[in-house]
């Protein structure tokens, strides 16, 4: 009795869904009551399918309402684990353990990344020096560096700070500021450059005609 996996690595985006599959041999018709399926993720039990039913009381709380065994796939010889609303904590090595006459197990790695897609921006001006402060902020994983460039492709020197997100423990909150003397309609770009998997996300900042003076300066 041998189980197989078509993929031993899945890469999924934070907040997305993933279905990981282990295939097991089924001759003729599946006898559900002879089938045993366990899914574990390191020290956490996710699925315990015995005697034709899933026992949710033994499921680890971190997977509650998010993980399920796709029962219809069992008849096709597939133990498919579906996880919805994927979290960074879901990353790791999963193990499917299947008993059907014989018994076997296989490991599958899940990697989770979070692109720095929603970049919020702010432009303010110092009334004394007339210097503009440009700010870009986004959350993602893993860590990113921020590259500032001008419309003529000059690389500019900004200041970046990285903190942990309030939303999720492992998510990074990356904020970068650029102080520069700029004129109206001038365009600047902040690019969040992330490695593993490599991805760039850029926001465009256009210097407005007139900026309101901060209330504290009035």
């Amino acid at each position: 009795f041998t189980i197989t996996v078509s993929k031993d690595l899945y890469v999924v985006e934070y907040g997305g869904n993933v279905t990981m599959e282990c295939k097991f041999p089924v001759e003729k018709q599946l006898n559900l009551f002879a089938l045993i399926v366990y899914w574990e993720m390191e020290d956490k039990k996710i699925i315990q399918f015995v005697n034709g039913k899933e026992d949710l009381k033994v499921q680890h709380s971190s997977y509650s309402q998010r993980a399920q065994l796709l029962k219809d796939q069992l008849f096709l010889g597939k133990a498919a684990l579906q996880i919805t609303d994927v979290r960074l904590q879901d990353a790791g090595v999963y193990c499917c353990l299947i008993g059907y006459g014989g018994a076997d197990y296989k490991r599958i790695t899940l990697k989770v990344h979070a692109p720095y897609r929603n970049i919020s921006q702010r432009i303010s001006v110092d009334p004394v020096t007339s210097e503009h402060e440009l700010m870009c902020q986004a959350e993602g994983y893993p860590e990113a560096e921020v590259i500032w460039t001008s419309s003529d492709h000059r690389v500019l020197s900004g200041k970046t700070t990285i903190t942990n997100s309030n939303r999720e423990e492992k998510l990074f909150n990356v904020t970068s500021t650029l102080n520069i003397n700029a004129t109206a309609n001038e365009i600047f770009y902040c690019t969040f450059q992330r490695s593993g998997p490599e991805e760039n996300n850029t926001a465009e900042l256009v210097i407005p005609e007139r900026l309101p003076v901060p209330a504290s300066e009035r």
Partner: antibody
Framework: QVQLVQSGAEVRKPGSSVKVSCKAS????????ISWVRQAPGQGLEWMGR????????NYAQKFQGRVTITADKSTSTAYMELSSLRSEDTAVYYC??????????????WGQGTLVTVSS | QSALTQPASVSGSPGQSITISCTGT?????????VSWYQQHPGKAPKLLIY???NRPSGVPDRFSGSKSGTSASLAITGLQAEDEADYYC???????????FGGGTKLTVLG
């Protein structure tokens, strides 16, 4: 109330093997992972491996790989741990322990009383 | 050499509070894994005190609490009592070893 009852103390010569049993009563045996943990005299706890009895699938700590075999008999709700090529450093109390709901390896809520294995020539 | 590092001993007087630390790495305590704590009296089997970092099984007094931050976990005992004198062990899953690991143990002495 779940109870794990282990076999009695054993004395073995270096190079030989020992097989310790752990009989469960008062709860579902086969679907919970059963681990074996040992404790040498005056030393700390050391995880050796685990089995899911309903599947008969066992995983072992790297240190014991090739020397330990964990098995289970669903019909008698008994788990077994066999350690071969015994040496004096294997003298220890061997415990079986059951993993609680939601977990696969740690978080042992029920323990056997322990079995002392003495390896001496 | 244990995978998780605990102080060899701690002590306190009755009524006092103590904390026992358990330091690991990113592959065990510092990962997404959960830490459990056990109490062991001489000649007895260990008893589960804390599971899943900070949860107490029924029957364990609320004087015992667990927490985790980064690659370290802690067991706190408030209002020390004579019967708390025992050895305490932390445990976690180690993803680099694909198995369970224990700390070396901490002997708690209740003075006086």
């Amino acid at each position: 109330q779940v109870q794990l009852v282990q076999s009695g103390a054993e004395v073995r010569k270096p190079g030989s093997s020992v097989k310790v049993s752990c009989k469960a009563s008062g709860g579902t045996f086969s679907s919970y992972a059963i681990s074996w943990v040992r404790q040498a005299p005056g030393q700390g706890l050391e995880w050796m491996g685990r089995i899911i009895p309903i599947l008969g699938i066992a995983n072992y700590a790297q240190k014991f790989q090739g020397r330990v075999t964990i098995t289970a008999d669903k019909s008698t709700s008994t788990a077994y741990m066999e350690l071969s090529s015994l040496r004096s450093e294997d003298t220890a109390v061997y415990y079986c322990a059951r993993t609680m709901d939601g977990y696969s390896y740690g978080n042992f809520d029920y323990w056997g009383q322990g079995t002392l294995v003495t390896v001496s020539s | 050499q244990s995978a998780l590092t605990q102080p060899a001993s701690v002590s306190g007087s009755p009524g006092q509070s103590i904390t026992i630390s358990c330091t690991g790495t990113s592959s065990d305590v510092g990962g997404y894994n959960y830490v459990s704590w056990y109490q062991q009296h001489p000649g007895k089997a260990p008893k589960l005190l804390i599971y899943g970092n900070s949860n107490r099984p029924s029957g364990v007094p609320d004087r015992f609490s667990g927490s985790k931050s980064g690659t370290s976990a802690s067991l706190a005992i408030t209002g020390l009592q004579a019967e708390d004198e025992a050895d305490y062990y932390c445990q976690s899953y180690d993803s680099s070893l694909s198995g369970s690991v224990f700390g070396g143990g901490t002997k708690l002495t209740v003075l006086g």
